[in-house]
Structure formats: C-alpha cells, structure tokens
C-alpha cells in the first residue's frame, strides 16, 4: 500500500515524524518543492521539544522552515494553525523589513544561528528541513 511505516533512508525518526536535513541551500519555494517531491513538507514546529530537536540537528546555521506570510497572514505549510500554535521568534521579529534593498519585505521564516526564528527574503539560499509524518496505522503498538 501507500502507507509510510518507517522513515526513508537518510531521514531521522523522531516522535512519529521523519526529518531530513539539507547541507546545501535553496530559495524557500525551491526548498518547499524539494520536500514535496519527497512526499514531505518544510518542517512545521509545533512544540518546544520539536524546536530543540531540529535545532540540535541543524546547528547554528540559517535554515528554512515551513512558515510564510506570502499571501498575507502567517501560515504553516501543512495547515497547522499559526495563531494558537508554538512560536519562537527573535525579539522584535517578524518585522517584514524592507531595508535589505532586494525589493519587497520579508515573507519566509527561518531558524537563525541561535535557533530562534526570523523572517527573511524568500529568495535567500538557506538550508532547509523536510518533515513527513509516519502513517497513523504504523503508529499503533504491535499486537503481541
């Protein structure tokens, strides 16, 4: 069948999800497409525990996550509610800064060197993290 019962090769399993950490950089939309081609999505951070897990694996490097406000309000790529969900912005972020001179503001969120989040120009070539959930059918304990 099409159920994903274990993580693909080179992915890391954690709390019923699989994670893949890039070592090269792409613009946010291209990173998003890369994840989608893997039947995954850019990482959606829903808890402090997940934040610490991802932070541990990426190190002090700017890294895209699945959060953007390209169409107005901030949205997670998997539909997780932003307003009521976990957030870990740097102080005074997001600020939709226009002073970078690249045109427009800042519409895509990334982990900064200390793990906290910042909004930045979506075209910047940052590393990225893909996430996919293990199927619910595979999460039930085996019958003994």
């Amino acid at each position: 069948g099409s159920e994903r019962t274990c993580c693909p090769v080179n992915w890391v399993e954690h709390e019923r999800s699989c994670y893949w950490f890039s070592r090269s950089g792409k613009a946010w939309a291209d990173a998003d497409n890369y994840c989608r081609l893997e039947d995954a999505h850019l990482v959606v951070v829903t808890s402090w525990e997940e934040q610490k897990f991802v932070q541990h694996h990426i190190g002090p490097v700017n890294t895209w996550m699945g959060l953007h406000d390209q169409n107005g309000p901030w949205k997670w790529v998997d539909g997780t509610d932003y307003e009521t969900g976990f957030k870990n912005w740097r102080p005074e972020q997001p600020d939709d800064w226009y002073g970078h001179g690249l045109g427009g503001g800042e519409d895509c969120a990334h982990f900064t060197d200390d793990g906290r989040w910042n909004d930045d120009v979506c075209q910047r070539p940052y590393r990225w993290v893909c996430e996919t959930e293990l199927d619910k059918a595979s999460q039930e304990p085996p019958l003994l």
């Epitope: 099409s2 070592r23 090269s24 497409n33 081609l37 893997e38 039947d39 070539p125």
Partner: antibody, heavy 121, light 108 residues
Framework: EVQLLESGGGLVQPGGSLRLSCSAS????????MSWVRQAPGKGLEWVSA????????FYADSVKGRFTISRDNSKNTLYLQMNSLRAEDTAVYYC??????????????WGQGTMVTVSS | DIQMTQSPSSLSASVGDRVTITCRAS??????LNWYQQTPGKAPKLLIY???SLQSGVPSRFSGSGSGTDFTLTISSLQPEDFATYSC??????????FGQGTKVEIK
C-alpha cells in the same frame, strides 16, 4: 536491471488526446519521484511534468499546465501522462526519467528509450 | 524560470583532443548543475551531477567545474564513443528543471 519503457506515442490531430505509459522495473518504484521530459525534433530537452514517489505532489511546465496530467500506479510500477488539447508544438520524443535525490541535489539518472508523439492534421 | 545557455552550439574535434563545453545560467544556481550525454536516437545519460560529482560508471576523463552562473564540462582526451550531444541542466530552481540547448561534438 533498472529499466524504464515508454509506450503510447503516435500520430494525433491537433486538439486530440493521447495517454503515455512508462513501465518501471529493477528498482523500488514508489521510492522515487518521476518526470516526463520531451525533445522536439532537432531541439534541446524540455522538462514537462513530475510526480512525487507516492503521488502526493505533481508539477507541470507552464507550456502544458491545464492540458497534461501526470499520475502513477505504484501497484503496477507504471507512470502515466494524459495529454489533452494537443498542439503542433507538443510534437516530440517523450522520455520518462527517474529523479535521483542526493544530499539536496537532484538529477535524472535513469531514462526510458522514448516514445514519439506527432501532432499533425 | 532560469535560462541555461551553452557554448559553442557545436564543435569539431579529433580523438585524443581536450574538449571544453561551457554553460551559463541566467542567475546564480550555486553548484546545482548536471551534465548529460546523448547520442542520436538514444536517451540522455547522466554524466555529472552537483557540478563536479561523477555519476557511477562514467569514465574519469569527464570532469565538471564552476559555480554560480558559469560552468564547464571537460573531456580530457576525447574517445570515439564521446562524439555526441552534451546538455547542461540546472536543479536549483526545480521544478521547473531547465536544460541548455545542447552542444554537438563532431568528428573533425
């Protein structure tokens, strides 16, 4: 042996439809995203469409969006391209290709032999 | 979309020659650059991925270099089976993956 084999090409009138198939063998088909790439006579390669391994995501070149539909049947190890509203400029050899993903980079590492599609009245 | 431009469109060379083909991207693609070889009536064959990584089974006389917008495919000593068309492809902005128009290497 890892192999891709296309079929379904032929001569079709403008506005007509055609369905291409690509049969895969020698690898775990569902683990790979797949693409269709075409080559018009005497021209370069043009990517047409892609689909993720489990079929959850699809992508199309602007030139075929709304006319072509990519799909796959992993139980049959087969990739499809449904082509509607065909135009003369769709005339080409159509290849199916396997996407190899390595450390964030990707390339097409396995190609079929191609099937010719001719759109003419 | 990112445009890929190859030069020259064709070249004539002899067995044993060193051959260089260039590929230019319309914007920076870092090292997300692949090279393919295609002989008439056959499917393309992946030679090099990620700018300089040789695909399994490809002879070491093929090499790739470059970064950003300018890339080079070099054949250090041309062999009879190397007379073919060579195409570059970017995988930075993908999809859409885009290819160069091809460079035909002919016998002098």
């Amino acid at each position: 042996e890892v192999q891709l084999l296309e079929s379904g090409g032929g001569l079709v009138q403008p506005g007509g439809s055609l369905r291409l198939s690509c049969s895969a063998s020698g690898f775990t088909f569902s683990s790979y995203a797949m693409s269709w790439v075409r080559q018009a006579p005497g021209k370069g390669l043009e990517w047409v469409s892609a689909i993720s391994g489990r079929g959850g995501s699809t992508f199309y070149a602007d030139s075929v969006k709304g006319r072509f539909t990519i799909s796959r049947d992993n139980s049959k190890n087969t990739l499809y391209l449904q082509m509607n509203s065909l135009r003369a400029e769709d005339t080409a050899v159509y290849y199916c290709a396997r996407r190899l993903a390595l450390d964030g980079y990707d390339a097409f590492d396995i190609w079929g032999q191609g099937t010719m599609v001719t759109v003419s009245s | 979309d990112i445009q890929m431009t190859q030069s020259p469109s064709s070249l004539s060379a002899s067995v044993g020659d060193r051959v260089t083909i260039t590929c230019r991207a319309s914007q920076s693609i870092s090292n997300y650059l692949n090279w393919y070889q295609q002989t008439p009536g056959k499917a393309p064959k992946l030679l090099i991925y990620a700018e300089s990584s040789l695909q399994s089974g490809v002879p070491s006389r093929f090499s790739g270099s470059g970064s950003g917008t300018d890339f080079t495919l070099t054949i250090s000593s041309l062999q009879p089976e190397d007379f073919a068309t060579y195409s570059c492809q970017q995988s930075y902005s993908s999809p859409p993956w885009t290819f160069g128009q091809g460079t035909k290497v002919e016998i002098k």
